[in-house]
């Protein structure tokens, strides 16, 4: 297993609709053809694999399971979007990148993006 640098923004504010997007960039030391990206949430004394995707370079990301994430890739960048977030989902979201093929296997883990989610205020009652 070889180490690899992964960069991601320090802070992101989710939209009022509970959507947060950020870029995860990795310094690929070679020509990887198969890449796995996992988003981890570290908060509340827990570590959770929020979503994971495997993709072949140049193709769309295919997310596993009941994913609340979507994303696209461009070169060594992955554009990740997490949907359906609420204030309680605020936390540190860490990007983990694995170069699966061809060998050797590389692993990189970012420092995390602190995603802040603010629940929208309910609209006041209207007389109209």
């Amino acid at each position: 297993c070889k180490a690899m640098h992964v960069a991601q923004p320090a802070v992101v504010l989710a939209s009022s609709r509970g959507i947060a997007s950020f870029v995860c960039e990795y310094a690929s030391p070679g020509k990887a053809t198969e890449v796995r990206v996992t988003v981890l949430r570290q908060a509340d004394s827990q570590v959770t694999e929020v979503c994971a995707a495997t993709y072949m370079m140049g193709n769309e990301l295919t997310f596993l399971d009941d994913s609340i994430c979507t994303g696209t890739s461009s070169g060594n960048q992955v554009n990740l979007t997490i949907q359906g977030l609420r204030a309680m989902d605020t936390g540190l979201y860490i990007c983990k990148v694995e170069l699966m093929y061809p060998p050797p296997y590389y692993l990189g883990i970012g420092n995390g993006t602190q995603i802040y989610v603010i629940d929208p205020e309910p609209c006041p009652d209207s007389d109209f």
Epitope: D44, Q46, E49, C51, A52, L64, D66, G84, L85, M88
Partner: nanobody, 125 residues
């Protein structure tokens, strides 16, 4: 709801290992996110680990990360908790639980509506 029965608990020395099993019956097992919780005497029930419906995504409490591994076999309607390097503070009754919801960011708070009867894990020095 599904019916859940845990097994595999017991007495083990510090540093030892156990594998807990959770057998499900009833509704379609693969529709449920599965979780493990534990409760020590005089303490609140706490989240240990959870696994998504297909088994591809997992969540762990910091206190067990790297020592415990959650897994599932949908064909056999089973969930498992492999526990290594057990510590005195791991002693508790361990419960298997099922939540009929998809995965998300905070599986510890999912609406687990099915619970097993629990299995006792005792770690001694």
């Amino acid at each position: 709801e599904v019916q859940l029965v845990e097994s595999g608990g017991g007495l083990v020395q510090t540093g030892g290992s156990l594998r807990l099993s959770c057998a499900a019956s009833g509704r379609t097992f693969s529709n449920y996110t599965m979780g493990w919780f534990r409760q020590a005497p005089g303490k609140d029930r706490e989240f240990v680990a959870a696994i998504s419906r297909s088994g591809s995504l997992k969540s762990y409490a910091d206190s067990v990360k790297g020592r415990f591994t959650i897994s599932r076999d949908n064909a056999k309607k089973m969930a498992y908790l492999q526990m290594l390097f057990l510590k005195l503070e791991d002693s508790a009754v361990y419960y298997c639980a099922a939540a009929p919801v998809p995965w998300g960011t905070r599986p510890s708070t999912f609406p687990y509506d099915s619970w097993g009867q629990g299995t006792q894990v005792t770690v001694s020095s």
